[in-house]
Amino acid sequence: EEELQVIQPDKSVSVAAGESAILHCTVTSLIPVGPIQWFRGAGPARELIYNQKEGHFPRVTTVSESTKRENMDFSISISNITPADAGTYYCVKFRKGSPDTEFKSGAGTELSVRAKPSAPVVSGPAARATPQHTVSFTCESHGFSPRDITLKWFKNGNELSDFQTNVDPVGESVSYSIHSTAKVVLTREDVHSQVICEVAHVTLQGDPLRGTANLSETIRVPPTLEVTQQPVRAENQVNVTCQVRKFYPQRLQLTWLENGNVSRTETASTVTENKDGTYNWMSWLLVNVSAHRDDVKLTCQVEHDGQPAVSKSHDLKVSAHPKEQGSNTAAENTGSNERNIYGGSG
């Protein structure tokens, strides 16, 4: 009788994670007597996957009827495959003895596991940045196999080109991770913008995974200030307004200064939102000019999102108004330090 051969017909098998892998093996002879064993890897560190003779292998089942001696099919099925199962599997015939001795091995079947990448996670800079600045976004996805993967960046549907991507590890591994950093130049209109990281992989069947970051969490649009005055009903009263325009985020504190002295401080509350996502706010002061002998320098000082204050001043010419003594008949103090100035916001 011809000497036994161990035939593993498949050089490689590819299986999706979670599925079962069938590894084929047949022998050409019933002799010598002895068990078949399956190993992952070769050499002294090889891992026993299945032993016909003994042991408990809960994930492994034999494909053929193993209770008939004439059965020469020793194919196995391994259930619930994970990337950690990847490797080369050898079907090995042993000769019965003490100890059992390896008689002949198959050529091996390489099992590759197709594992989906995790949902991409996009993270932006720790601190907010202002328009015209360049900020970095990172995108990470893990646990995929095989190694080949495509990553693209978009800003509002427009593909970005300034990015760098690494897939780790460089050598063979059961699964891989991708890390990409994209550079994005901010504009004043980016409050509603999104940065998207898109990952395409063979396991996703043409339906890429996306991770997003809202630039609203990254951008700071500093306000523009405009201080104006217009006369009010009474000749001796002037309404001074501070228009705070196009700022983001909403966190803003405004202080009125009269000749350098704090008159009133308020926090932006009832703001109006612009189409681009920025906010506008207005604060006003009602100034009784008859109470002043000299010109008044009114300053609108704004502290936005914890940044250094910006301010805009307005010189109120007192000489242009007749001074009427005793005309300061304020009935209430609306937060000002002196009874000759009234304020509000809107």
């Epitope: 009788e1 002879s29 019933l30 002799i31 007597v33 002895g34 068990p35 078949i36 016909q52 003779k53 003994e54 193993s66 209770t67 008939k68 001696r69 004439e70 059965n71 019965k96 003895g97 003490s98 100890p99 059992d100």
Partner: antibody
Framework: EVQLVESGGGLVQPGGSLRLSCAAS????????MHWVRQAPGKGLEWVSA???????YYTGSVKGRFTISRENAKNSLYLQMNSLRASDTAVYYC????????????WGQGTMVTVSS | DIQMTQSPSSLSASVGDRVTITCRAS??????LAWFQQKPGKAPKSLIY???SLHSGVPSKFSGSGSGTDFTLTISSLQPEDFATYYC?????????FGQGTKLEIK
């Protein structure tokens, strides 16, 4: 149903011959190592002979040169030709099937009695 | 030839008892050891192979262990039908050899 049925036993004089048969059913005999085991009256079990799937044969020392194991695939049968019989060969002879991969005995026949006496 | 020695040669026990029979090989036989049960006037019945694997249809009250030279057969809770003679056998190499048997009797 997997079954082994022995026949051919009986009374024979010392120096005589006997041929035991074992008819297998429910499996292909040629795919298994097959054995003969005997048990002298009131004694324990003794392995006698085996034939492998390739036709290789094995014997215990006391029967070498006197007994011959064989099989006939067409009849799905196993045989034990016993020559130069001795009184010490008196026993119940069992036909036994070796296991699927390790030759562990799994199926036994009911046995046939061989008595060697003058 | 490999010698197989069983102990004890006979054993008296009661229904419900747990009993252990030992078998020693004169040299390392890996785990190619089988256990058989035989009742008077009947053919032996295969119980265990490769020291600890139960043949199909054998109740789980029978268990085997061991490797190399020392082996045991344990019956966890004796029933009336378990009183019989038990044999061990090495089948690592020819000539296959049996132990002399252990007769399990009702006390």
């Amino acid at each position: 149903e997997v079954q082994l049925v022995e026949s051919g036993g009986g009374l024979v004089q010392p120096g005589g011959s006997l041929r035991l048969s074992c008819a297998a059913s429910g499996f292909t005999l040629s795919s298994y190592d097959m054995h003969w085991v005997r048990q002298a009256p009131g004694k324990g079990l003794e392995w006698v002979s085996a034939i492998g799937t390739a036709g290789d044969t094995y014997y215990t020392g006391s029967v070498k040169g006197r007994f011959t194991i064989s099989r006939e695939n067409a009849k799905n049968s196993l045989y034990l030709q016993m020559n130069s019989l001795r009184a010490s060969d008196t026993a119940v002879y069992y036909c036994v099937r070796g296991g699927v991969w390790d030759d562990a005995f799994d199926i036994w026949g009911q046995g046939t009695m061989v008595t060697v006496s003058s | 030839d490999i010698q197989m020695t069983q102990s004890p040669s006979s054993l008296s026990a009661s229904v419900g008892d747990r009993v252990t029979i030992t078998c020693r090989a004169s040299q390392d036989i890996n785990n190619y050891l089988a256990w058989f049960q035989q009742k008077p006037g009947k053919a032996p019945k295969s119980l265990i192979y490769t020291a600890s694997s139960l043949h199909s249809g054998v109740p789980s009250k029978f268990s085997g262990s061991g490797s190399g030279t020392d082996f045991t057969l344990t019956i966890s809770s004796l029933q009336p039908e378990d009183f019989a003679t038990y044999y061990c056998q090495q089948y690592v190499s020819y000539p296959y050899t049996f132990g002399q048997g252990t007769k399990l009797e009702i006390k």
